[in-house]
């Protein structure tokens, strides 16, 4: 059968028809519809939205649209017993209390069910004690405090500014340092861009604005009570004491008005250097405790949130493939939000909605994709990627045999400067080729390609004339597909200018001020950036689902493997004497990378030459491409992180958002000079080199001629 027998139009025309059908006005309309009330995971409002999306996807023309529900552990503030932080005097009287809610934005004063700022999954507790300011609470910040400044956080309440790393890592670091509570706050240095007004007059964070977010350290486990398995009706659930990734100390977020009141009184040590100073008019003293006049005052946390097993709902839509219905290309993004979700997630969900509508329109005209496309609206992403992970756990056997690719679709924008792409190296050429065909929405690039504006604004640090494409980390719903199952994955969104805007994320992230108006007034009034992101995400899905030969280039993996091997070798070479003493050699890894490079090159040559009209050979070659990502999976997982199984990439152990290459070796080498037993530590480095070399070699062999 010809791969285009299901349609009477050529592949090129199909893509054009699909892209031409995408409309900015529709994305705008969908965004408005999705953001009028909160859609917190586990609430009735979010269930109703799931049913609405199910109904609309059916209307758009998908073959089937089902709800997949799971009962997972979620966390909510106590409605009658609010969370707050106080300063108490020596008599125990509360002389200052932090605010209980964010002042609602104009037009939303009468909206009910706005969840107050809280740190999801914080345990209950009312610790009191001296405060220690720990900067961003990164690993290196605690090293600075404990090793250089000799400041002990044991038994202290620490206050950390948001930014740089995932908040769960901050809490884990504080726990390991012995802290008994954590206060998270947004510093204007990170969440207030100079020259821009606060919301509602601009896109900056007002002093009363607060970032919500979960503080789990799940390491890919999904529902904390059912790691590895779906949280279905007959699930066996762990006791709360055995739950995965829950913090052990109370945590609470505040805005910078409240942070000012806590930080202005700080005494003790001065900040070690300017990188510890934010933009508030406070000394940024580290502590511990308050200065002279206030030294008898303490900080007290009052946290009463509860963890509850709650039902969540994914929406799963199917567009059956005409030729290879057992090959799945997945487009997924989450639906649940902390409050209105103006950017996160609904700017992404609106784009998915329009992509589904466009595919549905083509289908109604008689077209079908070559491969099956699955569309997903995930629930409870904000509570630890729970909806996507539970669904993938339930369908893991199908996915590992049939999953071609996963394209993520959370927030479409985090700025309006240029494109940002993170993906497997297998997709580099797909992204390059697609963006060369799309028009740039950027001012000053009229008539130019997206590739051109992207390359100009975000050049690759290694290859001139090419754009930067980053490693996949985590913190979003692709995690289970890529890091656990080894399905080729990618994500794209419009981003800020990282050179000039040094704040972390976008200022109003996870606050009540993330509204439709924020997007429509300040970020993308014409919805042209949303449309571009829809074209990139949709175009990738189209190509992955419809191209006769999968648009994966294994040679690009060879290039990055060499780069990553060089990088990890240079890290190890900071310990030349130990490498000699313990006979540490990277020869096996470099040899495996060399073999991979040669075999990938030969495979690519065969890919150009084989008979594409032979369906068996075509399927065989495509399977080798599909299963290449899978070949990088180690069934045993990484040390202490069994659900992170990809040997080439994992979320950084120090920042879930960031990707790390050769993570097993990297973690074995990290801070190795502080391992009390160097013999054991370097033995683990050697073991990790062995695992990496074996995996690269084994992956290379999957590309060899089959017989």
């Amino acid at each position: 059968k010809s791969s285009n027998e299901a349609t009477n139009i050529t592949p090129k025309h199909n893509m054009k028809a699909f892209l031409d059908e995408l409309k900015a006005e529709n994305i705008k309309k969908f965004l408005y519809n999705f953001t009028q009330i909160p859609h917190l995971a586990g609430t009735e409002q979010n269930f109703q939205l799931a049913k609405q999306i199910q109904s609309q996807w059916k209307e758009f023309g998908l073959d089937s649209v089902e709800l997949a529900h799971y009962d997972v552990l979620l966390s909510y503030p106590n409605k009658t017993h609010p969370n707050y932080i106080s300063i108490i005097n020596e008599d125990g009287n509360e002389i200052f209390n932090t605010s209980l809610f964010e002042p609602p934005p104009p037009g939303y004063e009468n909206v009910s069910d706005i969840v107050p700022p809280f740190s999801a999954f914080s345990p209950q507790g009312m610790p009191e004690g001296d405060l220690v300011y720990v900067n961003y609470a990164r690993t290196e910040d605690f090293f600075k405090l404990e090793r250089d400044m000799k400041i002990n956080c044991s038994g202290k309440i620490v206050i950390a500014r948001y930014g740089k790393v995932f908040r769960g890592n901050k809490v884990k670091n504080a726990q390991l340092a012995g802290a008994k509570g954590v206060i998270l706050y947004s510093d204007p240095a990170d969440y207030f861009a100079p020259g821009v007004k606060s919301y509602p007059d601009g896109w900056n964070l007002p002093g009363g604005g607060v970032q919500r977010g979960n503080i789990l350290n799940l390491n890919g486990a999904g529902d904390p009570l059912t790691p590895g398995y779906p949280a279905n009706e007959y699930a066996y659930r762990r006791g709360i004491a055995e739950a995965v990734g829950l913090p052990s100390i109370p945590v609470h977020p505040i805005g910078y008005y409240d942070a000012q009141k806590l930080l202005e009184k700080m005494g003790g040590s001065a900040p070690p250097d300017s990188s510890w100073r934010g933009s508030l008019k406070v000394p940024y003293n580290v502590g511990p405790g308050f200065t002279g006049n206030f030294s008898t005052q303490k900080v007290k946390m009052h946290i009463h949130s509860t963890n509850e097993v709650t039902r969540i709902y994914n929406v799963i839509g199917t567009l059956r493939g005409a030729v290879e219905p057992d090959r799945y290309v997945i487009l997924g993004g989450h639906r649940d939000s902390w409050v209105f979700g103006g950017i996160d997630p609904q700017s992404g969900a609106a784009v998915v909605h329009e992509i589904v509508r466009s595919f549905g329109t083509l289908k109604k005209e008689g077209w079908r994709p070559r491969r099956t496309i699955l569309f997903a609206s995930w629930d409870a992403e904000e509570f630890g990627l729970l909806g996507s992970t539970e669904w993938a756990e339930e369908n893991s056997r199908l996915l590992q045999e049939r999953g071609v690719a996963y394209i993520n679709a959370d927030s479409s924008i985090e700025g309006n400067y240029t494109l940002r792409v993170d993906c497997t190296p297998l997709m580099y050429s797909l992204v390059h080729n697609l963006t060369k065909e799309l028009k740039s929405p950027d001012e000053g690039f009229e008539g130019k390609s997206l590739y051109e504006s992207w390359t100009k604004k975000s050049p690759s640090p290694e290859f001139s004339g090419m754009p930067r494409i980053s490693k996949l980390g985590s913190g979003n719903d692709f995690e289970v597909f890529f890091q656990r199952l080894g399905i080729a994955s990618g994500r794209a969104r419009y981003t800020k200018n990282w050179e000039t805007n040094k704040f972390s994320g976008y200022p109003l992230y996870h606050s009540v001020y993330e509204t439709y108006e924020l997007v429509e007034k300040f970020y993308d009034p014409m919805f042209k950036y949303h449309l571009t992101v829809a074209q990139v995400r949709g175009g990738m899905v189209f190509e992955l689902a419809n191209s006769i030969v999968l648009p994966f280039d294994c040679r690009d993996y060879a290039v990055v493997l060499r780069k990553y091997a060089d990088k990890i070798y240079s890290i190890s070479m900071k310990h030349p004497q130990e490498m000699k003493t313990y006979s540490v050699s990277f020869d096996s890894l470099f040899s495996a990378v060399k073999n991979f490079t040669e075999i990938a090159s030969k495979f690519s040559e065969r890919l150009q030459d084989f008979d594409k009209s032979n369906p068996i050979v075509l399927r065989m070659m495509n399977d080798q491409l599909m299963f290449l990502e899978r070949a990088f999976i180690d069934p045993l997982g990484l040390p202490d992180r069994p659900f992170y199984r990809h040997v080439i990439y994992a979320p950084s152990s120090h920042n879930k958002y960031a990707g790390e290459s050769f993570p097993g070796i990297y973690d074995a080498l990290f801070d190795i000079e502080s391992k009390v037993d160097p013999s054991k530590a370097w033995g683990e480095v050697k073991r990790q080199i062995y695992v990496a070399a074996f995996t690269v070699q084994a992956a290379a062999e999957t590309l060899s001629e089959v017989a």
Partner: antibody, heavy 117, light 107 residues
């Protein structure tokens, strides 16, 4: 193999000075904190001083503060202890140690310092 | 400074005996407790760190336990080469401090 070799011990009069050296081999010296621990004849162990890998941070026992100075030369893989205003109670075997997280993981064989008139 | 108190200060035992030495800190040191062995005329040698982790090359008859303020070193079956003095040391906070030592002698 990690090795530490102390030298510079000997007999010195009260109020006198002595400089101990410790030559290190078998590990990347500049990556590790180093320290001195002493043991008076027939007595237990006493931590004397520690220095960070870069040499930027030092700490001392109260009993030697202001009199002893720890230093290192990473280019020579050598640790030093400059001991001034020596007292009879400083008489001890002085051990050089590689220090990881305040744990003395590897020790030299020691050098005897005797303060006596 | 944190005071470290070892007991007993000395003990007599026979080859094959199970020997237990205790170490008490004047305040909680969580699990930052290390044990060293010193033979006459020799430098000390690290046996156990972080209360219970055996250093590479140390025989498995040695084990450590405890947390907070009370810690134990156990030799499950005393061997001739184990007759020595044993010291505990806290590495929780500077200045680091040692216990007074426990001398294990042949009965």
């Amino acid at each position: 193999e990690v090795q530490l070799l102390e030298s510079g011990g000997g007999l010195v009069q009260p109020g006198g000075s002595l400089r101990l050296s410790c030559a290190a081999s078998g590990f990347t010296f500049g990556n590790y904190a180093m320290g001195w621990v002493r043991q008076a004849p027939g007595k237990g162990l006493e931590w004397v001083s520690t220095i960070s890998g870069s040499g930027g941070s030092t700490s001392y026992a109260d009993s030697v503060k202001g009199r002893f100075t720890i230093s290192r030369d990473n280019s020579k893989n050598t640790l030093y202890l400059q001991m001034n205003s020596l007292r009879a109670e400083d008489t001890a075997v002085y051990y050089c140690a590689r220090v990881i997280r305040q744990v003395a993981t590897t020790w030299g064989q020691g050098t005897l310092v005797t303060v006596s008139s | 400074d944190i005071q470290m108190t070892q007991s007993p200060s000395s003990l007599s035992a026979s080859v094959g005996d199970r020997v237990t030495i205790t170490c008490r800190a004047s305040q909680s040191i969580t699990s930052y407790l290390n044990w060293y062995q010193q033979k006459p005329g020799k430098a000390p040698k690290l046996l156990i760190y972080d209360a219970s982790t055996l250093q590479t090359g140390v025989p498995s008859r040695f084990s450590g336990s405890g947390s907070g303020t009370d810690f134990t070193l156990t030799i499950s079956s005393l061997q001739p080469e184990d007759f020595a003095t044993y010291y505990c040391q806290q590495s929780y906070i500077t200045p680091v401090t040692f216990g007074g030592g426990t001398k294990v002698e042949i009965k």
